[in-house]
Amino acid sequence: HTVELNNMFGQIQSPGYPDSYPSDSEVTWNITVPDGFRIKLYFMHFNLESSYLCEYDYVKVETEDQVLATFCGRETTDTEQTPGQEVVLSPGSFMSITFRSDFSNEERFTGFDAHYMAVDVDECKEREDEELSCDHYCHNYIGGYYCSCRFGYILHTDNRTCRVECSDNLFTQRTGVITSPDFPNPYPKSSECLYTIELEEGFMVNLQFEDIFDIEDHPEVPCPYDYIKIKVGPKVLGPFCGEKAPEPISTQSHSVLILFHSDNSGENRGWRLSYRAAGNECPELQPPVHGKIEPSQAKYFFKDQVLVSCDTGYKVLKDNVEMDTFQIECLKDGTWSNKIPTCKIVDCRAPGELEHGLITFSTRNNLTTYKSEIKYSCQEPYYKMLNNNTGIYTCSAQGVWMNKVLGRSLPTCLPECGQPSRSLPSLVKRIIGGRNAEPGLFPWQALIVVEDTSRVPNDKWFGSGALLSASWILTAAHVLRSQRRDTTVIPVSKEHVTVYLGLHDVRDKSGAVNSSAARVVLHPDFNIQNYNHDIALVQLQEPVPLGPHVMPVCLPRLEPEGPAPHMLGLVAGWGISNPNVTVDEIISSGTRTLSDVLQYVKLPVVPHAECKTSYESRSGNYSVTENMFCAGYYEGGKDTCLGDSGGAFVIFDDLSQRWVVQGLVSWGGPEECGSKQVYGVYTKVSNYVDWVWEQMGLPQSVVEPQVER
């Protein structure tokens, strides 16, 4: 009979064991264990009848298709075998054990005691067959095993081979190299690789296989296992395999698909190819006259670009547009994207107008092209070029007029100062009062009219000032101070100030330049109690044009001593001859109390100590500070008066041969103007030179060339 055993271990004994087994007996034990296990069988006791080749009694161990062992007897002989210490191992998970006794036993035989157990199969060690073994890594466990793959590989659905994901390779560069995965190592199994070369339309892909070419093949059937196919539009080239690479392929297309297929077996090294884009050739190019083409090549193909540039002093001209460079491109149809432009000489065009200046052309026909030369000059004698610049400008390669020092900036024509169009008389008779000034004698003289319309009725007064530049007037702070204040110093609104320049006769303002104020700047330390720091500036709304009747006066050098005692200076003004008259009467045309024609007087500088003493001897709190100086005569008769305030006291500077403003008419009194021993007090301008330049926003160096040393 047959006994089915399914346990992982067990014991098998001969019938009647440990008594002797019966005759004519046959028992089969079928042992089945799970897959991944084999069966190990060994005997603890064995005693059967001996016979030649175990013909009588025996124990036979077998699998489905193979006898593993036949045992009988008590001890092994040449013709019979006992198990002894031998272990029987099934190749698979099934083992069949058959016990048989014949009809007669000459003596009593005790039979056998056997044990079996399921033992794990180490598939990783034992699988020799490539068809079954793991492609990369094998991992054994009790009852089974599994496979895994190297980095970058994926386990195939057969759970054994390792493939790669290589179906998404896009190449868009004009040249490139494509290889089988892992090249030059063997390519992965069970893979479907797809390589797409997609170039811009107009290019054609050329393929060339290089180095090793090794794809599994078959001696009879063309490429049944692994292969390359090349798809160009509807056309398919290949399959290719074996060890001989295909010849270079000119696809005549900008789009190519390369398919590579590998099956689940084989160890081949794969392939490598390079591809290159080819384009249509464009015609040869000739550089323009006075120009060049970069890069310079014998041949140009689709997508090649060239840059056309011109020699120094020339500009690329394309469709009447000037440019520095022009780029053209070889198109897919083998034509150039544009015609070669021409090179045109750079033209700086008409040079910029110079305020208060003139332009002369050094080159014939007033040429304004590259390397042409012009010369700027200032309107002399009223303006002089700053820093004694040459004024020479050359047309540069960039198309701009360039000066060696100033670059593309225009020169500056600075007003000349202290040089009247008429020379001032060197001697003035010591007469009582002043005399009429000829037009152009005091071209810096300004009449400042202040009309404060913010009060009802309006306040109106006037004073004098001195032109320092085309935009700035120097005057006394008390002229521009809001009059309705007792001790506080607040400037009048700029809207209330009008400045007249080039004025000779106040009855005829038609020839004068009148200007509004853009800014009114009082010295921050002006003291209304003692008139210390009595200096102010008016910035004009627009620069005034200079000419014979309108020219600035020079500022002095910074010297705390001020003008030397007994030096003679001139001061001009339309001041009041009768001090008891009101400004409204002065401004109205019917009165002669305001001098119609500009008056001037020559006065000597009074030693400081003498002036201080003359004022200290008076009742009242008079203070002649170091920021003031006095001028006039002990006996009186000549003086400045109301309405002259802010006017310039000028002294001729022998070094520079120019008239310099040393003082500003400030105060005097309390007696009438021109009284005996009543000196006029003037603001000492030389103490404020830095402050004046700072307010005007000009570096002091600007003025240095004007007052040569």
């Epitope: 913010s454 009060r455 009725p457 109106k460 007064w461 609104s493 009101t582 400004v583 109301l642």
Partner: antibody, heavy 113, light 112 residues
């Protein structure tokens, strides 16, 4: 015609603030100073300060510097005077004046608890 | 601040008679630059706003009767009503126009 029209009478509690308005017409409001003057019942005139509407410049009588604020709205040609921390002695008629010829009709401000 | 002292405090004058009001300043009000005295005179009738009569010490405002005149310079100023009319009954104030502006205490003019 040229005139200054002031806001109506106000009654305020001590410690409160009052804002009196003065609307100008008939001249260029921005270019002339507006003064503020007050007159306590049966008393003389007292100058509070002034504003130039175009620039916003102001001058204050020291006595009122901490409590009075002048403003001007040029779009409506209206000047304002605000007086804070009111006390009973601030009871007065407050005038705005175009410096210095044209007077408003006055605004009575009564400060009473 | 400049202090203005008006005198007398009140004045009773017969109709057609001259009325004189004085105003003394603690500081000189003459401005040598504009050659003006910054002093004005105002008239305030009962229940009305003040009205400008004289500015710059002596200039009559337009529309003001010529019986009103101003004089003086520096620190001493006078308002004169040459022939008092019934409509001239009012309080008269002087005002100086250096900031901060100040007013005199006022002079009440009545008919005797």
């Amino acid at each position: 015609q040229v005139q200054l029209v002031q806001s109506g009478a106000e009654v305020k509690k001590p410690g409160a603030s009052v804002k009196v308005s003065c609307k100008a017409s008939g001249y260029t409001f921005t270019g002339k100073w507006i003064e503020w003057v007050r007159q306590a019942p049966g008393q003389g005139l007292e100058w509070i300060g002034e504003i130039l509407p175009g620039s916003g410049s102001t001058d204050y009588n020291e006595r009122f510097k901490d409590r009075a604020t002048f403003t001007a709205d040029t779009s409506t040609s209206t000047a304002y005077m605000e007086l804070s921390s009111l006390r009973s002695e601030d009871t007065a008629v407050y005038y705005c004046v175009r410096s210095e010829d044209l007077w408003g009709q006055g605004t009575l401000v009564t400060v009473s608890s | 601040d400049i202090v203005l002292t008006q005198s007398p405090d009140s004045l009773a004058v017969s109709l057609g008679e001259r009325a004189t009001i004085n105003c003394k300043s603690s500081q000189n009000l003459f401005n040598s630059r504009t050659r003006k005295n910054y002093l004005a005179w105002f008239q305030q009738k009962p229940g009305q706003s003040p009205k400008l009569l004289i500015y710059w010490a002596s200039t009559r405002e337009s529309g003001v009767p010529d019986r009103f005149s101003g004089s003086g310079s520096g620190t001493d100023f006078t308002l004169t009503i040459s022939s008092l009319q019934a409509e001239d009954v009012a309080v008269y104030y002087c005002k100086q126009s250096y900031i901060p502006f100040t007013f005199g205490g006022g002079t009440k003019v009545e008919i005797k």
